[in-house]
Interface confidence: low
């Protein structure tokens, strides 16, 4: 509550998280021409990448392009990409939604369809939809282990959300425990009123919020943290602004002296935790 | 404007950007000792980085130094670094601006210089200039997609920049389309007074601003971004203190059984999105 | 000081950190059963990542796991991990603190110990502690620089912390240099009272405060930033609470068509730079 | 491995008390919550109790104020004692034990179980 005698001071704040959890994945692997039903094990080296700060992202869902080279080949058939001579294609064009740069040529993608030949990773990915249910479904009961360490400068205060007389077995409860610095992410989609199954196929952002409201006085003194949840990306958002939250990374290799790649495009959650609060002292 | 009756607080912001367009990259590539022109394509997962938060990197140049292995070899003769004789050498010395740990022998480099010999990744990096004009300078036409979600805790108010009106084919522009939040990168340059194609050379920081002046009040309520771009680098910055913005990463692989590496040094342009403002209410 | 009579504003802020250095290290490498004394380089690629904005990290330590494929083995034998029969082990099970999915049977991890089998990448990390004294334990010479650009908006002030009058070849101290911004690591954890050899060994975070109080008055103006150093991180931390800094990352592969992986557990500093302070101007 | 036996169960009058008790055996230095839930004829397994490692204790709604839950450490025990009882309280109780950090409530967290102890409320 706002004490008007008080001098307020905004919160400095540093933030390290740790996720955990393993995350069994189901997929169609084709290798040879047949395709056959591969099971893999992901773990957080697997899934989520070394980040700094107030953010961290864990992968719920991927498409992969493997084996691609740089070459000529017929770009992707999406909706209004195919051809019927060279005249549609014009050499030196990038479009935007394409994957490469086209040499001009109207060339056979399959056997129904042609489509403009372009410079590029190839073959080029294929624009199929993300897989339903995400592969990394289970990643919903991942736990994160949230420290943040607080100071107000002019008030040389220092403090940190975990005190000693916590333990590391507990798990954040809205009413039950509301301290703990330990939550489960389906916990964190439940309290923001989101499905988490859902998000996890386009991926999106999700926000946690720490609030620090503190009233240094020592004869009223507290200092504690708040947590709140509400996705950050919107749901509703038109296709053109590019939905849920993905990139693409790739790994690069040799094969027979040649630079190949294989490009994931991975979709997840992207968590941000926001800091805020006041330290107030007469 | 300053309304003195109203209870102003900061903006909480989260950020997520998404860059477009590809490059074609013309290079001499030397194999086997012949030299030739060497085209290639790269895309989003070649030139940008996952990042997270309010910053995003567009890589605009590189020098590569292939085939790297640990062993013991001259290092680059830089200015000041020649030898005559083993005296010059200091075994395990670690000259900063060198890649190596002196052996305190002095070996021949090539026909005509001789350096210390050094413990390192070899042969060591040539410090050449970066490639003028830069090999990626046609990122000057990708574009970035920028989504700011913020909120005002304290007056339970969330917005976004971009609104259900909005649509994906709009690009940014002062006058005829300010709440456009997909930017050109030689635009937003261009707004800061910039020359991108310089820029590209060395690499340099960019700072897009997004300012939230926001009445909350319902009877005179506004609450829109505006954006304004500026250079953050110091382009006439001491050599000293390394100018542009360039870092170095390794890609690690196995040859015959022996641990390799390409080093990449990277050159390009970080994006650092600003957001600032406060939202008042009687 | 407080001058009430002016209109304050907070900083807005962009850092940009180069890190110098190079670690000799010295482990025991063991190939085709036998082991030797294996000394390696490392350098910025191999010891720091491509990061953005207030956070840099330096790797100090590390443990490694190489040649790990998925399939199934038996999960590390640690305290209470151990079994006799297939009763203890349940067939899906995911232990936080194993690596894998229990097949739900009871195999020999060596020959004297028994523990459940695990689909995972395999074998299985070993559990063992941080090398001590820390691999990289020399980082604690290597040096930073960092360059601060600051803006008040609403005074239409920008400065930065790197000022023409300096060079690049001071190193920060309290009383003799308290302007230059390239700081040597062990200086920084000095002036915190903390021990970089003893840190290095698990991790840890340091903040280094960057404060600007600005009077931006022409007849008393002064704009310069005050550098301090604290430990972010709880060194007291419960066990359960994950005390230190590590996170793990992967180098994947392919031999004989396999995929592959080097786990590494990757222990060091992260480094939060936190700027902040006001401008105020009458 | 971790065994789990529940005892005190019984008929009772509504407005009646009962106490019941669970001893683990085995790897018990794993465990970090344990609970009890229920399961009336004829309807799912439900939530009534729990406790965390640190002695933070969670209550389902419809039992909050008439039981008190409670643990020893040393001896490996919870117990569970129920006041003012009512005739919907009449049900299979489970104890249940994890050793992971998911929330109290959810059934699926729990690695081990005990064979159930019946406890009928008469009116």
């Known amino acids: 509550s706002d004490k008007l005698y008080q001098r307020k001071e905004p919160v400095i704040s540093s933030v390290h998280t740790k996720v955990k959890g393993i995350a069994e994945v189901t997929e169609n692997v084709t290798e040879g021409g047949v395709t056959k039903l591969g099971h893999s094990i992901f773990d957080t080296a697997d899934y989520t990448f070394p980040l700094q700060g107030n953010s961290f992202f864990v992968m719920t869902n991927y498409v992969k392009s493997e084996g691609q080279v740089q070459t000529l080949c017929p770009e992707y058939p999406r909706r209004g990409a195919q051809c019927s001579s060279d005249r549609r294609c014009k050499k030196g064009w990038m479009d935007p939604q394409s994957k490469g740069i086209q040499t001009g040529r109207c060339v056979p993608y399959d056997k129904t369809r042609k489509t403009c030949e372009v410079s590029a990773w190839c073959p080029t990915e294929e624009e199929k939809e993300a897989p339903r249910p995400a592969l990394l479904r289970s990643a919903e009961n991942f736990t994160v282990l949230i420290k943040n360490n607080i100071h107000f400068p002019g008030h040389n205060y220092t403090t940190r959300n975990i005190l000693p007389t916590m333990n590391g077995s507990c798990t954040f409860h809205k009413t039950w425990d509301p301290q703990c610095s330990i939550f489960r992410l389906g916990d964190i989609f439940q309290e923001a009123g989101e499905n988490f199954t859902e998000v996890a196929v386009q991926g999106g952002i999700m926000g946690i919020e720490i609030y620090w409201d503190c009233n240094l006085d020592s004869w009223s003194h507290h200092c504690r943290p708040r947590y709140s949840f509400r996705r950050l990306d919107d749901k509703n958002m038109d296709e053109s602004f590019v939905p849920g939250y993905n990139f693409r990374y790739a790994k690069y290799y040799k094969e027979n002296n040649v630079e190949k790649r294989t490009l994931i495009k991975a979709f997840g959650i992207r968590f941000d935790i926001l800091v805020f609060g006041t330290g107030g002292k007469f | 404007s300053d309304k003195l009756y109203q209870r102003k607080e900061p903006v909480i912001s989260s950020v997520h950007t998404k860059v477009k367009g590809i490059a074609e990259v013309t290079e001499n590539v030397t194999e086997g000792g012949v030299t030739k022109l060497g085209h290639s394509i790269f895309d989003t997962a070649d030139y940008t980085f996952p990042l997270q938060g309010n910053s995003f990197f567009v890589m605009t140049n590189y020098v590569k130094s292939e085939g790297q292995v640990q062993t013991l070899c001259p290092e680059y003769p830089r200015r000041g670094a020649q030898c005559s004789s083993d005296r010059r050498c200091k075994k395990g010395w670690m000259d900063p601006q060198s890649k190596g740990i002196q052996t305190g022998r002095c070996v021949p480099y090539d026909k005509t210089r001789k350096t210390c010999e050094v413990s390192a990744w070899c042969p060591t990096e040539e410090e050449k200039e970066a490639p003028r004009p830069a090999l990626l300078r046609s990122a000057e036409n990708f574009t970035v997609l920028i989504k700011n979600n913020i909120h005002f805790p304290g007056h339970n108010y969330t917005t976004r920049n971009i609104l259900p009106t909005m649509n994906g084919s709009c690009t940014f522009h002062k006058t005829w389309d300010p709440q456009c939040s997909i930017f050109r990168l030689g635009d937003i340059f261009q707004e800061a007074g910039e020359n991108f194609t310089e820029v590209a050379v060395q690499g340099g920081i960019m700072g897009i601003e997004i300012y939230w002046d926001c009445n909350l009040d319902s009877w005179s309520h506004h609450c829109r971004p505006r954006y304004s771009f500026r250079r953050l680098d110091d382009k006439n910055m001491d050599e000293s203190f390394v100018p542009g913005y360039n870092f170095r990463y390794a890609k690690y692989y196995k040859e015959n059984n022996v641990e390799k590496r390409t080093l990449i040094k990277a050159f390009g342009i970080r994006f650092d999105i600003l957001v600032f403002g406060t939202g008042g209410k009687f | 000081s407080d001058k009430l009579y002016q209109r304050k504003e907070p900083v807005i802020s962009s850092v940009h950190t180069k890190v110098k250095g190079i670690a000799e290290v010295t482990e025991n490498v063991t190939e085709g059963g036998v082991t030797k004394l294996g000394h390696s380089i490392f350098d910025t690629a191999d010891y720091t990542f491509p990061l953005q904005g207030n956070s840099f990290f330096v790797m100090t330590n590390y443990v490694k796991s190489e040649g790990q494929v998925q399939t199934l083995c038996p999960e590390y034998p640690r305290r209470g991990a151990q079994c006799s029969s297939d009763r203890r082990c349940k067939k899906g099970w995911m232990d936080p603190q194993s690596k894998g999915i229990q097949t739900g049977r009871c195999v020999p991890y060596d020959k004297t110990r028994k523990t459940c089998e695990v689909s995972a990448w395999c074998p299985t990390e070993e559990e063992k502690e941080a090398p001590r004294p820390a691999l990289l334990r020399s980082a604690e010479n290597f040096t930073v620089l960092i360059k601060n650009n600051i803006h008040f908006p609403g005074h239409n002030y920008t400065t930065r912390n790197i000022l023409p009058t300096m060079n690049g070849s001071c190193t920060f101290h309290k009383t003799w240099d308290p302007q230059c911004s390239i700081f040597r690591l062990g200086d920084i954890f000095q002036e915190a009272g903390e021990n970089f050899t003893e840190v290095a060994v698990q991790g840890g975070i340091m903040g280094i405060e960057i404060y600007w109080d600005c009077n931006l008055d022409s007849w008393s103006h002064h704009c310069r930033p005050r550098y301090s150093f604290r430990r972010l991180d709880d060194k007291n931390m419960d066990e359960s609470f994950v005390p230190g800094y590590n996170f793990r990352y992967a180098k994947y592969y392919k031999e004989n068509n396999v995929e592959k992986r080097t786990l590494i557990k990757a222990f060091g500093i992260r480094f939060d730079i936190l700027v902040f302070g006001t401008g105020g101007k009458f | 491995e971790v065994q789990l036996v529940e005892s005190g169960g019984g008929l009772v009058q509504a407005g009646g008390s009962l106490r019941l008790s669970c001893v683990a055996s085995?790897?018990?230095?794993?465990?970090?919550?344990m609970g009890w839930f229920r399961q009336a004829p004829g309807k799912e397994r439900e939530f009534v109790a729990a406790?965390?490692?640190?002695?933070?204790?969670h209550y389902a709604d419809s039992v909050k104020g008439r039981f008190t839950l409670s643990r020893d450490n040393a001896r490996n025990t919870v117990s569970l004692h129920m006041n003012s009882l009512k005739p919907e309280d009449t049900a299979v109780y489970y104890c249940?034990?994890?050793?992971?950090?998911?929330?109290?409530?959810?059934?699926?967290?729990?690695?081990?179980w005990g064979q159930g102890t019946q406890v009928t409320v008469s009116s």
């Open positions: 249940a034990a994890k050793a992971n950090y998911e929330s109290p409530s959810r059934e699926t967290s729990y690695a081990y």
């Open positions: 085995g790897r018990t230095f794993s465990i970090l919550t």
């Open positions: 406790i965390s490692g640190i002695g933070a204790i």
